[in-house]
């Protein structure tokens, strides 16, 4: 689970260490606060929960790209 | 706060070798990706390459492929540039930066390399 | 490699202008641009990365907007410490590729 450190800084200090489908993921954001000990991938699944993910692995990253694609595609 | 700080500069000859440092402070350097970008005089900026720290993973521009090795030291928090076959063209002022997601948040001082004979 | 081309390469403008750079991928970056800020003899300096994301410390003035390959970097009210060259750079995908740079220089 993130940490919020103060009102305008969450950090990530663990990783999940489960690979999470694409299906349940609706959204990410990017921790990169030199505030924290890491950089981060903060996904929020489609229930709303928060989970902390490392962006140096290939599923986190291979997650982002398919996020960043379907925002970008006009929903039919 | 995160600081990177470079050696200084270096005037070399063509054929020759060059290798540039770059201590990190402020951040352990295997949660992160060190980067190189250089910056030839009055010229833009050109991404070299990256290593992970944590398993010595490194991707290039396939420009430098072959001629630049990318190292680092978790022990000291230090990364390494090295170029080889220097030539003229090479004459830059060189960074290191920081960051995991392939944009730079924190950036060396840079280090000026004079290429001539 | 992405290609991005930036314009103008140079432009004069005034205190308080409202100045605005553009950045043309050659293909879909699907957001993933960063812009920074360079003053002379110094390092670049983070302003924007991704959608909308300001680094922290950076002024609101600044911001950023655009989608497939056409971005743009605006400075709503130009201050006298905006006078520097900007650059926009993908990272899409590797090789991580930026603008040949755009100049703002005081009129």
């Known amino acids: 689970q993130p940490d919020a450190i103060n009102a305008a800084v969450t950090c990530c200090y663990n990783f999940t260490n489960r690979k999470i489908s694409v299906q349940r993921l609706a959204s990410y954001r990017r921790i990169t606060s030199s505030k924290c000990p890491k950089e981060a991938v903060i996904f929020k699944t489609i229930v709303a929960k928060e989970i902390c993910a490392d962006p140096k692995q290939k599923w986190v990253q291979d997650s982002m790209d398919h996020l960043d694609k379907q925002t970008q595609t006009p929903k039919t | 706060q995160v600081q990177l700080v470079q050696s200084g500069a270096e005037v070399k000859k063509p054929g020759s070798s060059v290798k540039v440092s770059c201590k990190a402070s402020?951040?352990?350097?295997?949660?992160?990706?060190m980067h190189w970008v250089r910056q030839a005089p009055g010229q833009g900026l050109e991404w070299m390459g990256r290593i992970d720290p944590e398993n010595h993973n490194t991707k290039f521009d396939p420009k430098f492929q072959g001629r630049v090795t990318i190292t680092a030291d978790t022990s000291t928090s230090t990364a390494y540039m090295e170029l080889s076959s220097l030539r003229s063209e090479d004459t830059a002022v060189y960074y290191c930066?920081?960051?995991?997601?392939?944009?730079?948040?924190?950036w060396g001082q840079g280090t000026t390399v004079t290429v001539s004979s | 490699d992405i290609q991005m081309t930036q314009s103008p390469s140079s432009l004069s403008a005034s205190v308080g202008d409202r100045v605005t750079i553009t950045c043309k991928a050659f293909e879909d970056i699907y957001n993933r641009r960063a812009w920074y800020q360079q003053k002379p003899g110094k390092a670049p300096k983070l302003l924007i990365h991704g959608a909308t994301s300001l680094e922290h410390g950076v002024p609101s003035r600044f911001s950023g907007s655009g989608s497939g390959t056409d971005y743009t970097l605006t400075i709503s009210s130009l201050q006298p410490e905006d006078f520097a060259t900007y650059y926009c750079q993908q990272f899409w995908s590797a090789p991580y590729t930026f603008g040949g740079g755009t100049k703002v220089e005081i009129k």
């Open positions: 930066a920081r960051g995991v997601f392939g944009f730079f948040e924190h």
């Open positions: 402020g951040l352990t350097i295997s949660h992160t990706y």
